[in-house]
Structures are given as C-alpha cells and as structure tokens.
C-alpha cells in the first residue's frame, strides 16, 4: 500500500467479515480489507474483515509476518474473499497446532 495521506472522502470497500468482531454480519465496509492468521493457545485462528480507520490499516498492513501472526491486506470490493493469510514457515512446521476458524 502506498504511504499516502487519507482523502477527505476516502473510498470505502466491501469486505468479507469472519470472526468475533463481525457480530452476526458476514461483511463490513472500510478503507482496506484484510485476512489474518494467528496462533492462539495452539490453534490457528483465521479472521477476515475491514480496517475501518486509515492509520490502523497503514500500521498493521506494514507489519511483516511473524511465526505467530500474519496479516494480508488489499483494497477493492470483496478483495479478501479468496485470500488466506499464511504464516512464514522457513522450512519449519509448528507442532501441536490445529486449524480453527472464528465464525
């Protein structure tokens, strides 16, 4: 994402929303969409949603993936539909983890 100042009337994108923050909605609207994966108590936790504030997305999307968390960001309507964040493996696997989608 380019390091530009937010527009006065920023473009909003429809994004897939999956996870606890979505309530009972399966979509949200924001300036960026994301797909994330984190390891929580040995579980792979997948979430999708919106960065609703410009600065929040700017910071998070620039954070490089770590063994415990990865976030992929995009701009475009429903652009996170077919994105699944991946943890960096570097040839290593993480034993004792399970896949878990927060719905």
């Amino acid at each position: 994402m380019e390091d530009e100042k937010p527009k006065v009337n920023p473009k909003l994108y429809m994004c897939v929303c999956e996870g606890l923050s979505c309530g009972n909605e399966d979509h949200c609207e924001g300036q960026q969409c994301f797909s994330s994966l984190s390891i929580n108590d040995g579980f792979h936790v997948y979430q999708k949603g919106c960065f609703q504030v410009y600065e929040q997305g700017k910071m998070t999307c620039k954070t490089p993936p770590s063994p415990g968390q990865a976030v992929e960001c995009c701009q475009g309507d429903w652009c996170n539909r077919n994105i699944t964040a991946q943890l960096p493996t570097k040839g290593k696997s993480f034993p004792g983890t399970q896949n878990f989608h927060l719905e």
Epitope: L12, D26, H27, C28, G30, Q31, Q52, V53, D77, W78
Partner: antibody
Amino acid sequence: QVKLLQSGAALVKPGDSIRMSCKASGYTFTDYIIHWVKQSHGKSLEWIGYINPYSGGTNYNEKFKSKATLTVDKSSSTAYMEFCRLTSEDSAIYYCVRRGHDGTGFDYWGQGVMVTVSS
Amino acid sequence: DVVMTQTPVSLPVSLGGQASISCRSSQSLVHSNGETYLHWYLQKPGQSPQLLIYRVSNRFSGVPDRFSGSGSGTDFTLKLSRVEPEDLGDYYCLQSTHLPLTFGSGTKLEIK
C-alpha cells in the same frame, strides 16, 4: 444497465404465504447485498432484512424475523422473499433493493410488488 | 432501534423557490469506521424511491446540484434550491449505521 425486476402483484388470503422474486441484471449478482423494504399504503418505509447472495448470509429486522425468509438462486441471479401467515397488516408494496458499494446506500430499487391480503 | 424524526411532514413550495428538510436521529449515526451513513431518497408519485444523497452530503450520479445534504452526528438537512416540477414527491431519510436500518417518516414536497 442495472435492473431489479420483481414479480407481479398478488392477492392472497389471510393465513396464506407468498413468495416474491427479484431478478437482477446488469451487474455481478454475488457482488452486491440485496435488501428488502416494506411500504404500507400511504406510510413510510420499513427495512425487512438483507441477504448476501455470495454467502447466503442473512440479517433480519427483529420485527420480521418470524414473518420473512430471504433466499437467493445464484444460477438465475434471483433473490426471493417468502412471507408467511399473512394478515391484513402485511398488505403493502415490497421492494428489493441493491446496496451499493462505497457507502452509497440503496442505489437501485425494484419496481415493487403490491401484495393485498383479503378474504 | 434508532428513531429518525423527519420534519416537516408537508412542505409547500413555489417553483423556483427553496426547500429545506430536517432529519434528526435518536442517537449518533457515526459508524465505528468514522463514516456517517445517512442517506436521502425521493419517491415520485407512483414510482420506487430513488437515491439522491448518500453519506450525508454526496450526490448520487445523475442527481442535479440543486440538491445538497449537510449535517453531522444526529442532525441532518436536505436542501433544494430552484425547485422544479420533477422534484415533487415524498422525501425520506435513511440511516444505515445501526441495525435495524430505519427511515424517517417522510416529507411531502408540494406546490404552494
């Protein structure tokens, strides 16, 4: 161009159910949320609920939860609303509406279905 | 539910004149994403409603610049300048910040 073509007017008996359709054209059906709105005669508008055609996910106004069921058929780009246990209070015009992107609200409306409940 | 109070109920205007419609919400319409989802619609006689203004002040495509929207928080206004015959009908505000979505009760714009 974007069009939402709704089924024709209906006269139904109290206690019956009705299923109305809304055929979308001129855009990618699964990319836009479809909402349904009720307009009673000479009155304002009431939001019934929405369906996400891509996922099938729905959200209902509590008032209509036991009355309306929203579905879609992706293959024909058609949204449906079934209304059950009809009473005279359900006599109204029902609109299907496309929820636009970029926060535009309801950008396209169907022509409406007039439902009359009478014995 | 968010209650949308729209005034006046009826608004007699002269052609070429100005009109102002108010919409007040029972709670703030600022969404967690910072946007305010307050929209304005016109329903001409015998037609479906049509979008005029979205997110408080943005004119929808094809809407003439004699329509303008303003406001913030809980207090919003639709202004019409140089009223034309095709502007007559029922005007509604809609909030889509909170579920359930709720409409104002409508304002009928008619010739004085």
